[in-house]
């Protein structure tokens, strides 16, 4: 039928919650083009009626909720004046219990997420919730092994829990909890995230200056390997962190099993008043996923991106 | 839909305290921050903190945080702020506002603005 | 606490010219969700304030198109595409990245 096929990485979820996924990738969906979706490689469309509980929803597939035999390859063709692009995403449905909800503790959690708290700074976490416009989202409410959060160092803004002064006994795990409304219905969403605590980011005395890169896109094409230089300078006796990180993770963790994407040894130059560092991202092979994600050098408190992004189709 | 409306103008003098009110309807009061924002003669906008119906929650610019008061009546979704202590410098208008949504920040929602004169 | 700096102070504009107002801010909006928490405002003579842009380059609701936002982590651009008798007023950048939230001090509009 003429489509490239692109296969994304499996999506873990938790069953008896909402879960919505997005069929967009830029630049293939920023001109005028049509999403479908599918299950299974079936000719049948998902559904578009908002009552289902399974429909798509411009372009994302919308669950309301999630349910045990919806596990899956589920494929969304983005057809566009002269392209044909099949998107195939794997959707892995299981049941996790976080707190044992027999005595009353929180439902069983979604996605497991990592993220870490700066020891001794003021940092936040951050509730992940991606679901297209139709859904009303809120009020987010935070706990920590089990027990909703209160106190004057924590405080909820939108999406995020900012956390004043944090220590070494804000590790643990962590949930986020919002409900979604949609069609006058409510479901419940529960994110866990484990969060640890690095002392590694150090101020120093100094803020580092990051010279390369500068939050832009490079154009890079499907399937090539790419190295990102990150270039930092910084005061001779700093003891900053310079790291590549990815949705607040670092790449070698976020990237563990597949080694994909690879951060590089770190290198310096030293000048008279001050040092050079270099250190690289590779992506060994650039996939689909890679594209629109901003990969965040972080050097102290100075942080800098790229996103990666398709060519512009050359019609010469 | 949503609305914020805000008491009267009200003139004091040095050294006393006032209490403005913030009444709010068209949504759920106890899920939303209510955010108080002053405005001096022919100036830029300054946060003053933050209350949170549910639970009571204060955040506070360091700036106020041993003047400044702020509570609610669920009864009546009102929120009320109370600025001690008065001085020239505070003559300003006051406005409550409301974020976008719960998980879109900025202040989409404004009172309509209440007018503290401090004069002796 | 976060510093956010205007330029220029005033500006005065052709009807259905562009026109563009810059913001600078002590420390990177950008956070590590990938979400900017960076804000525009205009507040017309006599009124409060009204959202413009939300996270950067969002339109708040009921935002006529010919506004813009864009910018990096420190440094943003609010773009008039053609301006109207209507625009005038003074405009405001704003932070909520961290507390206490911050205000530029405020850009005026004026139609020449």
């Known amino acids: 039928d003429g489509c490239k096929d692109i296969f994304m990485k499996n999506e873990i979820l938790s069953a008896s919650q909402p879960f919505a996924f997005n069929c967009t990738f830029p630049p293939i969906t920023s001109g005028e083009v049509s999403v479908t979706w599918y299950k299974n490689s079936s000719k049948i469309p998902v559904s578009k009626i908002i009552q289902s509980r399974i429909h798509q929803d411009e372009t994302w597939i919308l669950f309301l909720p999630m349910e045990w035999g919806d596990s899956g390859v589920y494929q969304c063709v983005i057809k566009g004046r002269d392209s044909c692009h099949r998107i195939h995403v794997n959707l892995t449905v299981f049941e996790k219990h976080w707190c044992d909800t027999s005595i009353g503790g929180l439902p069983n959690l979604s996605d497991e997420y990592k993220q870490i708290l700066h020891l001794g700074k003021d940092d936040s976490l951050t509730c992940h919730l991606h679901f297209p416009k139709s859904c009303v989202l809120g009020p987010i409410k935070w706990y920590k092994d089990c027990n909703e959060i209160k106190g004057e160092r924590f405080t909820v803004l939108e999406t995020r829990l900012l956390v004043s002064n944090v220590s070494a006994e804000d590790r643990g795990n962590y949930a986020c909890q919002a409900i979604l409304t949609h069609s006058g219905k409510q479901y419940e969403v529960l994110n866990g995230i484990t969060v640890s605590i690095t002392e590694r980011a150090g101020y120093g005395g100094s803020v580092p200056k990051i010279i390369y890169p500068k939050n832009h896109s490079i154009e890079v094409q499907l399937g090539t390997t790419l190295i990102v230089d990150c270039n930092v300078t910084d005061t001779k006796d700093n003891t900053n962190l310079r790291c590549w990180r990815v949705n607040n993770t670092l790449v070698d963790d976020y990237y563990d099993e597949s080694k994909r994407i690879r951060e590089g040894v770190e290198t310096h130059v030293s000048f008279r008043e001050h040092n050079l560092y270099t250190v690289n991202i590779t992506f060994l092979e650039v996939k689909m996923e890679d594209y629109g994600l901003p990969f965040m050098c972080h050097a102290g408190v100075s942080t800098a991106y790229i996103i990666l992004q398709l060519p512009a189709p050359d019609f010469r | 839909q949503v609305q914020l409306v805000q008491s009267g103008a009200e003139v004091k003098k040095p050294g006393a305290s006032v209490k403005v009110s913030c009444k709010a309807s068209?949504?759920?009061?106890?899920?939303?921050?209510m955010n108080w924002v002053r405005q001096a003669p022919r100036q830029g906008l300054e946060w003053m903190g933050m209350f949170h119906p549910y639970g009571d929650v204060t955040r506070l610019n360091q700036k106020f945080k041993d003047r400044v008061t702020m509570t609610r009546d669920t009864s009546t979704s009102t929120v009320y702020m109370e600025l001690s202590s008065l001085r020239s410098e505070d003559t300003a208008v006051y406005y409550c506002?409301?974020?976008?949504?719960?998980?879109?920040?900025?202040?989409?929602?404004w009172g309509q603005g209440t007018l503290v004169t401090v004069s002796s | 606490d976060i510093v956010m700096t205007q330029t220029p102070l005033s500006l005065s504009v052709t009807p259905g010219q562009p026109a563009s107002i810059s913001c600078r801010s002590s420390?990177?909006?950008?956070?590590?969700?990938?979400?900017?928490?960076f804000y525009w405002y205009l507040q017309k003579p006599g009124q409060p304030p009204q959202l413009l842009i939300y996270q950067m380059s969002n339109l708040a609701s009921g935002v006529p198109d010919r506004f813009s936002g864009s910018g990096s982590g420190t440094d943003f651009t609010l773009k008039i595409s053609r301006v109207e008798a209507e625009d005038v007023g003074v405009y405001y950048c704003?932070?909520?990245?961290?507390?206490?939230?911050?205000f530029g001090g405020g850009t005026k509009v004026e139609i020449k």
């Open positions: 068209g949504y759920t009061f106890t899920n939303y921050y």
């Open positions: 704003a932070q909520n990245l961290e507390l206490p939230l911050t």
């Open positions: 506002a409301r974020t976008t949504s719960m998980i879109i920040g900025g202040f989409a929602y």
């Open positions: 420390k990177s909006l950008l956070h590590r969700n990938a979400i900017t928490y």
